[in-house]
Structures are given as structure tokens and as C-alpha cells.
Interface confidence: low
């Protein structure tokens, strides 16, 4: 298969030879008749680059055709070529290359005595002789021309097209819509690669990732998603991973575990501020935080314990001589004598 | 911890005003939209409308729009929802919501939400 | 504004059963659409965006997929924590429009 950019393609519409003579004015020998002159009418075109003064000679450097017998003296041509399946109609002129935008065209109309009889060269078959020159821009609208010599008329059209994904103004350009690995994109006016919703770069194959996705923390392997990377978490990848087991702390860079007030300690875990948030000391004592979870109870009089939890009881052992019985008064207690005994702790005899 | 915390809602009567506020806590509050979204007793979703804080970009539904106004004050990280001429079917919980830039773009949703606050319209 | 229609309303099941919810736009919307679950005197959480994106910390037994105007929510295995109402909601063009709701009741 002929790799190319684009094609040059020719349309034969009409030919009239008014008089069914050649260009030397002989009648066609051998013709078809009647009439007794009739021309069997095939063309020879030749396709080259643009000449200021258009030589029928060789090489054709564009390209060159030569069509079967198409019709006697004067016919129409349809598109597609008619019942000869050896012509198509526009004859296709394959470019492996950029189009110049400038070419030059020869079309000779020849008659032949035998149809299988179409190359030999014999300047007495010819019937009229088209020579031009033309500025063509790419596209898809025909450009029709009429060629008129005293006896014959030829209306002709062409364009220059691009071959499937080929663009530009010399169909230079290539782009082929895919969306697989190697790219998500369909193909604008001019070929350039217009991505796919949710992928961008020059050949879309990089996901556009979550709105809001952060850039340097998260990444994405498909449109839409957002991905972490290490350290990071939340939808939008946003938020840093703090220290595993960090308790009452908070990061702005991942693994950090920076403590809330009144915590401490490698994971936050501490409690700094111990009496107020348990209030331990009982019994209206007086609570001291000595950092890293501890504090201290002092007591007010009669309690003691790491709390203060436990009242002093001040007849345990008795103080009280002589049978004396104890009652335990606050951070104090009193003494009952028997009778003969008297004093604080019944220790004086009335004897 | 993302948070989004509203009041200000309350009993109003028709043609009254109140406004609501949203406190934001636990993420840039000028990297999403905040979104108000209200349910009336009994009834489906119903957006009220949102803005950019960053840029003070707004939007409203077309129920609203003339008679609600959406601000934001990116030094409290607070948007708020002014409610004039109040009529008896803007009754229902009023939600604030977030949501990443251009709510457009690819469907990305809502994610965070606030408690809701009643506001009743009755004489 | 472009309507966002739900069907079924409601519907009841068991748990175990696979449930499907479909959400149909009034125009093409891409895919641009978000799936939410609000129980009775709660807000709304978020299931799925981008019509297909499992968000962050819902169970895998919810999946979402469609694009254009046809997407449907599935809960492949009922849960008894997934009776609830659920919405979709469209955000292609402003204003962000909300399906009516679907009532998953138990059977």
C-alpha cells in the first residue's frame, strides 16, 4: 500500500468533439461509425510540478494516467467511471509528500484504432492537447475548468484532499484519534490533538487528576481520581499522616506528632495538665501537676494518702490513760475520763 | 478534623430576615466552595446555592436568587447566609456543605457537611 | 435546570439482596454525578462521585456507575446500617440539581 499524505484527484465530466476529426483535421481511421469518422476517445493526463510554460514532455513528476477507451466523439462522464471497471472516476494521483500548492496538468485527448492498443505513442491519434498551470489549496470543494479549442471542448474539475488523518495545508500534519496508553484524544480541524475529557498534555495521556488534588502529595493514574502518596491522606491528599499511636497531637509534615496544649510525651499521650482534667486530690486538698502525667495532693489536717483519700484517726492508737475513751475530732480528739481522772488525756489522778 | 458548624437558625415570621453562618475548621477554607443545600420537613435535597471564598464567586438557585445573599469571611473561615423576605416554604434544615473549585468540572460531591439548622417561617 | 429523576421512590428489601437505584438526567451531563446517603435526622454523606468513584471509607459493597443521562447506584449485599434514603446529584451545569430520593426500607 502507497503511504501518503494526500491525493491529487481529477474528474473527466464532459468531452465534445464537434466534428469527430483529430487535431491534424484526418478523419479517425478505423473509427467506430457511423458517421464515418467517429473517434474512439481515450485520454492520456500527465500530473507535474507547477512550470511557468507547461512542457507535454516527460517525466510526469506528480504522476500519469492513461484511461481506456471512454466514449465516441462527444460524452458525458458520471462519477465513478460507468461500466469500465478499469477507470474511476476522479483518477487519484497518491502524494507521499507535503502538497506544494502549485501543479501543472496535461491531458491529452487520443483516439485508437484497437482499444487494446493505448501506449504506443503516435502524435497523428491525437485529438486535442490541454496544457495548464494552477495554484490549488487543499480542500474539499472541486474546482471546475472548461478547455475549449476550436473543435473540442473538455470539462474537467479536480482538488487536492488529505488522506484519512492527514491535515494542514500541505497535509503534513498527522493525527490519528486513539485512546489507549499512548494517548486519549480525537483530532481538531487542523490536526492538532485535542484531549479527551480528564486528560491533558501534548499527547494526553496524563490524568487530570480530583479537583483540589494536591500537586506535590497526590497524583492520579486515571481522570478524576486522587492518589497519595506517602504521608499523606484525605481525599485531596492534603492531609499529613501523623506519628503511629500519636494520641493528643497534630503534623504538618508527615510522622510529625506535635502536641495540643497540655499534653506531652513522644505520642502525645502525657497529660500535662493532670489536675484539672481528673481532679484527683480528695478532701479539698491542694493538686501540683508535676509534668508527664504526675501530680501531688498536699492534704489539709486529718488526711493523709497519695489523694488525700484517707481521714486521720486520731484515737488509733487511743491517747487516752486510765480507761479513758477517745472521740476523734478533726485533726484533734478528746478525752472522757473515769471518775478520779481528769487532765487532757486523763493522765491526772483526783486522788 | 474537617469540621462545618452552623446557626443561627430559628422561628422568623414571612417577610423577616435571619442570617445563618458555617464555621469551617481543619482545612484551607479558600481551596473548596462551600455550598448551602436545605431540606424542607419531609422532602429531597435542594440546593440553595454556594461561593468561592477565594474569590467571592457566588451562585443561587433560581428560587432564591434577590433574596438570599452567600458571603464569606476567609479571616474567620466562616461563610454565611443572609435570608430576606422569608416566605412559609423556605422552612427546612439548612445544611452547609463543601465542595472542590467549580462545581462543575467532573462531579466530585459534596464530601463534608455540617449538623443542619432549622429555620421555620410562621406567623 | 436540568432534572435529575430517581426511580424506584422506595423500595423494600432484605438484608443479603442486591439493590440497584437508578437516577436518569433531563440532558447529558458526562459524568458528572454524585451519590449520597441521609438517614432519618442526619445530613448526607457522600458515596460515590464521578458517577463511579468509590469516595474515601465507604464500604466496596457500593458502586456506581453510568455517563450521559443513565447512572445507577448498586448495593451488591444489604447491610442492616444501609437502610436509608438515597440521592444522586448532578454537577455538569449550574445549578446542581438533586434526584427526589430513594427510600430503602426493610422488607
Known amino acids: 500500500q502507497v503511504w501518503s499524505s494526500g491525493v491529487f484527484e481529477l474528474k473527466l465530466q464532459e468531452f465534445v468533439n464537434k466534428k469527430g476529426l483529430l487535431g491534424n483535421r484526418n478523419c479517425c481511421r478505423g473509427g467506430a461509425g457511423p458517421p464515418p469518422c467517429a473517434c474512439r476517445t481515450f485520454f492520456r493526463v500527465c500530473l507535474k510540478h507547477y512550470q511557468a510554460s507547461v512542457s507535454p514532455e516527460p517525466p510526469c513528476t506528480y504522476g500519469s494516467a492513461v484511461t481506456p477507451v471512454l466514449g465516441v466523439d462527444s460524452f458525458s462522464l458520471p462519477d465513478g467511471g460507468g461500466a469500465d471497471s478499469a477507470f474511476s472516476n476522479p483518477i487519484r494521483f497518491p502524494f507521499g509528500f507535503t502538497w506544494p500548492g502549485t501543479f501543472s496538468l496535461i491531458i491529452e485527448a487520443l483516439h485508437t484504432d484497437s482499444p487494446d492498443d493505448l501506449a504506443t505513442e503516435n502524435p497523428e491519434r491525437l485529438i486535442s492537447r490541454l496544457a495548464t498551470q494552477r495554484h490549488l489549496t487543499v480542500g474539499e470543494e472541486w474546482s471546475q475548468d472548461l478547455h475549449s479549442s476550436g473543435r473540442t471542448d473538455l470539462k474537467y474539475s479536480y482538488r487536492f484532499v488529505c488522506d484519512e488523518h492527514y491535515y494542514g495545508e500541505g497535509c503534513s500534519v498527522f493525527c490519528r484519534p486513539r485512546d489507549d496508553a499512548f494517548g486519549h484524544f480525537t483530532c481538531g480541524e487542523r490536526g492538532e490533538k485535542v484531549c479527551n475529557p480528564g486528560w491533558k498534555g501534548p499527547y494526553c495521556t496524563e490524568p487530570i487528576c480530583l479537583p483540589g488534588c494536591d500537586e506535590q502529595h497526590g497524583f492520579c493514574d486515571k481522570p478524576g481520581e486522587c492518589k497519595c502518596r506517602v504521608g499523606w491522606q484525605g481525599r485531596y491528599c492534603d492531609e499529613c499522616i501523623r506519628y503511629p499511636g500519636c494520641l493528643h497531637g497534630t503534623c504538618q509534615q508527615p510522622w510529625q506528632c506535635n502536641c495540643q496544649e497540655g499534653w506531652g510525651g513522644l505520642f502525645c499521650n502525657q497529660d500535662l495538665n493532670y489536675c484539672t482534667h481528673h481532679k484527683p486530690c480528695k478532701n479539698g486538698a491542694t493538686c501540683t501537676n508535676t509534668g508527664q502525667g504526675s501530680y501531688t495532693c498536699s492534704c489539709r489536717p486529718g488526711y493523709t494518702g497519695a489523694t488525700c483519700e484517707l481521714g486521720i484517726d486520731e484515737c488509733d492508737p487511743s491517747p487516752c490513760k486510765n480507761g479513758g475513751s477517745c472521740t476523734d475530732l478533726e485533726n484533734s480528739y478528746s478525752c472522757t475520763c473515769p471518775p478520779g481522772f481528769y487532765g487532757k488525756i486523763c493522765e491526772l489522778s483526783a486522788m | 478534623e474537617v469540621q462545618l458548624v452552623e446557626s443561627g437558625g430559628g422561628l422568623v415570621q414571612p417577610g423577616g430576615s435571619l442570617r445563618l453562618s458555617c464555621a469551617a475548621s481543619?482545612?484551607?477554607?479558600?481551596?473548596?466552595?462551600i455550598h448551602w443545600v436545605r431540606q424542607a420537613p419531609g422532602k429531597g435535597l435542594e440546593w440553595v446555592g454556594g461561593i468561592s471564598p477565594a474569590d467571592g464567586d457566588t451562585d443561587y438557585a433560581n428560587s432564591v436568587k434577590g433574596r438570599f445573599t452567600i458571603s464569606a469571611d476567609t479571616s474567620k473561615n466562616t461563610a454565611y447566609l443572609q435570608m430576606n423576605s422569608l416566605r412559609a416554604e423556605d422552612t427546612a434544615v439548612y445544611y452547609c456543605a463543601r465542595n472542590d473549585y467549580d462545581v462543575r468540572f467532573v462531579g466530585s460531591g459534596m464530601d463534608y457537611w455540617g449538623q443542619g439548622t432549622l429555620v421555620t417561617v410562621s406567623s | 435546570d436540568i432534572q435529575m429523576t430517581q426511580s424506584p421512590s422506595s423500595l423494600s428489601a432484605s438484608v443479603g439482596d442486591r439493590v440497584t437505584i437508578t437516577c436518569r438526567a433531563s440532558q447529558d451531563v458526562s459524568t458528572a454525578v454524585a451519590w449520597y446517603q441521609q438517614k432519618p435526622g442526619k445530613a448526607p454523606k457522600l458515596l460515590i462521585y464521578?458517577?463511579?468513584f468509590l469516595y474515601s471509607g465507604v464500604p466496596s459493597r457500593f458502586s456506581g456507575s453510568g455517563s450521559g443521562t443513565d447512572f445507577t447506584l448498586t448495593i451488591s449485599s444489604l447491610q442492616p446500617e444501609d437502610f436509608a434514603t438515597y440521592y444522586c446529584?448532578?454537577?455538569?451545569?449550574?445549578?446542581?440539581?438533586f434526584g427526589q430520593g430513594t427510600k430503602v426500607e426493610i422488607k
Open positions: 464521578s458517577a463511579s
Open positions: 446529584q448532578q454537577s455538569f451545569t449550574a445549578p446542581p440539581t
Open positions: 481543619g482545612f484551607t477554607f479558600t481551596s473548596y466552595d
